[in-house]
Interface confidence: low
């Protein structure tokens, strides 16, 4: 740090005083010097370092009419809203010719009620789930001791006994408030009051109970919800893009989910109006008067195939002697799965029914028994998937072939 030489007497006639106060205080340090000739610029030092951005004002008053006469120079350093970083030793510094002069030091100190660096924050926690709260305060004066309060009740016999910066709460069963008091020699400061809202635990063990082509029955185990009964649970289902689109940690599905509410108990819900043979992802959250639990992870599920919902369309059957030609079109109704083929049945008035599996073709030529003289022949067709046969078409009579 610069030092004044001993060759000449110090020009300072007034040195900075001392300031001690609480945070936020505003104060002024002042130094005065008397010099001959042109007045120098006064610099301020804190702990030996020049303050480049000091809030200082300099006043110069001539003591004579000639520039070479003496001048009185007064510099004032304003400290607004005193902070810990403002504390230290303050001096004035001037350069006169080839010499450097510094004033006697003044001291700025901070002393008051504790100041919070960190206070407990509002948060939500699942019932009976451990969590931590933080509180940190400083002086001076030190030491600062903390006392935690839960619902305005101290958690220790005195400040400094019990938890300090971090309070570990093993779990709550009701919404509670927490605050901390910071104590030092000057008194006590109380932190903000944090409200810890107790929500239901995340449901567990979400699983399928049974499944149908257009509905899934799911069940889950509710989590603890403290003193607040669950009011309902919400289940979301979303079509999987390829069955792999939603990973366990992914927060949102690719499209708007189908949302259903379940009264509880029982912790079970039948999800209807689903597509057959389709992969879905489902998740559940449960709600009490305090709010909802977190969602479970997305669970991949799949509806099974169903049978076709309608018969084949536009069936035509024409007969030419001992042969009959039958053709049809795929059912317009949903297939509810992968079409595996068609079954055809034909029967005469007094003859047994003949059943055939046609496969995926949509036409067939039938070789009729005998000379084709059987009367009142009718044909029915049904589509089938892996789940079984769809409804049979109405009987279609075989019409004699007429050359066009």
């Amino acid at each position: 740090a610069p030092r004044g030489t001993q060759a000449e007497e110090s020009p300072f006639v007034g040195n900075p005083g001392n300031i001690t106060g609480a945070r936020g205080l505003t104060g002024t340090l002042r130094c005065q010097l008397q010099v001959q000739g042109e007045p120098p610029e006064v610099h301020w030092l804190r702990d030996g370092q020049i303050l480049e951005l000091a809030d200082s004002t300099q006043t110069q008053v001539p003591l004579g009419e000639d520039e070479q006469d003496d001048w009185i120079v007064v510099s004032q350093l304003r400290i607004t809203s005193l902070q810990l970083s403002d504390t230290g030793q303050y001096q004035c510094l001037v350069f006169l010719g080839h010499q450097t002069f510094v004033s006697q030091p003044g001291y700025v100190g901070l002393e008051g009620l504790p100041y919070f660096l960190e206070e407990p924050e509002d948060r939500t926690v699942a019932a009976n789930t451990p969590f931590n709260l933080s509180c940190q305060a400083q002086g001076p004066p030190e030491p600062v001791d903390l006392l935690w309060l839960q619902d305005a009740v101290p958690l220790a016999t005195a400040p400094g006994h019990g938890p300090q910066r971090s309070l570990h709460v093993p779990g709550l069963n009701k919404t509670s408030s927490f605050s901390c008091e910071a104590h030092n020699a000057k008194g006590v400061t109380t932190s903000r009051t944090a409200t810890i809202t107790v929500l239901p635990q995340q449901p567990r063990n979400l699983h399928l109970v049974s499944r149908q082509p257009t509905e899934l029955e799911v069940a889950w185990t509710p989590g603890l919800s403290g003193i607040y009964p669950l009011t309902h649970c919400t289940l979301q289902a979303v079509l999987s893009d390829d069955g792999m689109g939603i990973q366990a940690g992914e927060p949102d599905p690719p499209e708007e989910p189908l949302t259903s509410q379940a009264s509880v108990p029982p912790h079970q819900l039948r999800l209807g109006s689903l597509h057959p043979h389709t992969p879905y992802h489902i998740r559940v959250a449960c709600t009490s008067s305090q709010g909802p639990s977190s969602w479970t992870h997305w669970l991949p599920v799949e509806t099974p195939e169903g049978v076709p919902l309608g018969p084949p369309e536009n069936i035509s059957a024409t007969r030419n002697g001992s042969q009959a030609f039958v053709h049809w079109q795929e059912p317009r109704a949903p297939l509810q799965g992968t079409l595996l083929g068609y079954r055809l049945a034909y029967q005469g008035q007094d003859t047994p029914e003949v059943l055939m599996d046609i496969g995926l073709r949509q036409e067939v030529t039938l070789e009729l028994q005998g000379d084709g003289s059987v009367s009142n022949l009718t044909v029915c067709v049904a589509a089938y998937t892996a789940a079984g046969d769809g409804p049979w078409s109405l009987p279609v009579p075989l019409e004699a072939w007429r050359p066009g």
Partner: antibody, heavy 122, light 107 residues
Framework: QIQLVQSGPELKKPGETVKISCKAS????????MNWVKQAPGKGLKWMGW????????TYADDFKGRFAFSLETSASTAYLQINNLTTEDMVTYFC???????????????WGQGTSVTVSS | DIQMTQTTSSLSASLGDRVTISCRAS??????LNWYQQKPDGTVKLLIY???RLHSGVPSRFSGSGSGTDYSLTISNLELEDVATYFC?????????FGSGTKLEIK
């Protein structure tokens, strides 16, 4: 390849506790649930329940609530079956079997351990 | 609970025979029917799941069929290594339940 290796046969006295281990290899342990199945000598298979290896959540069939406990040591890819207060009724073979995907148990038990026989005798 | 019934507790067949083992569920299980093989040494293997899907490594002589409540396992060309007890199991509803088993022997 996928393997489930169970601990060896156990000889216990009535009232004692047994803990059977099932070490999995060849797949991601926490992606698939672990089922436990009981088989009395010369008898059929009886499903005891399963444990979700992702969350550690066990599900017990009604007949196995109380003295039976499923647990995990995920870092060792190992599932455990503990039976407390053994009786001669527990003198059977226990199988672990790899099962459902994450928390969805409704998949076949596609790989089985070799079985652990428990003898209970005073 | 869903009851799984295997009415045939044991059957005897000759090598090369076609053997069918049946299983009935007390209610519709939506095709979630699995078949397991337990060898005389006690080892258990999955053979077929979802009525008819062969598990990896299972020979194609094994096949499954059925729907609703009635299901069957067929071995088309019996081999010596097929001597075992066969169990059906429903995977549609918890708790899972097994049939009582059908023991297959060679004549």
């Amino acid at each position: 390849q996928i393997q489930l290796v169970q601990s060896g046969p156990e000889l216990k006295k009535p009232g004692e506790t047994v803990k059977i281990s099932c070490k999995a290899s060849g797949y991601t342990f926490t992606k698939y649930g672990m089922n436990w199945v009981k088989q009395a000598p010369g008898k059929g298979l009886k499903w005891m329940g399963w444990i979700n290896t992702y969350t550690g959540e066990p599900t017990y069939a009604d007949d196995f609530k109380g003295r039976f406990a499923f647990s995990l040591e995920t870092s060792a890819s190992t599932a455990y079956l503990q039976i407390n207060n053994l009786t001669t009724e527990d003198m059977v073979t226990y199988f672990c079997a790899k099962g459902g995907y994450y928390s969805n148990p409704i998949y076949p038990m596609d790989y089985w351990g070799q079985g652990t026989s428990v003898t209970v005798s005073s | 609970d869903i009851q799984m019934t295997q009415t045939t507790s044991s059957l005897s067949a000759s090598l090369g025979d076609r053997v069918t083992i049946s299983c009935r569920a007390s209610q519709d299980i939506n095709n979630y029917l699995n078949w397991y093989q337990q060898k005389p040494d006690g080892t258990v293997k999955l053979l077929i799941y979802y009525i008819s899907r062969l598990h990896s490594g299972v020979p194609s002589r094994f096949s499954g069929s059925g729907s609703g409540t009635d299901y069957s396992l067929t071995i088309s060309n019996l081999e010596l290594e097929d001597v075992a007890t066969y169990f059906c199991q429903q995977g549609n509803t918890l708790p899972f339940t097994f049939g009582s088993g059908t023991k297959l022997e060679i004549k």
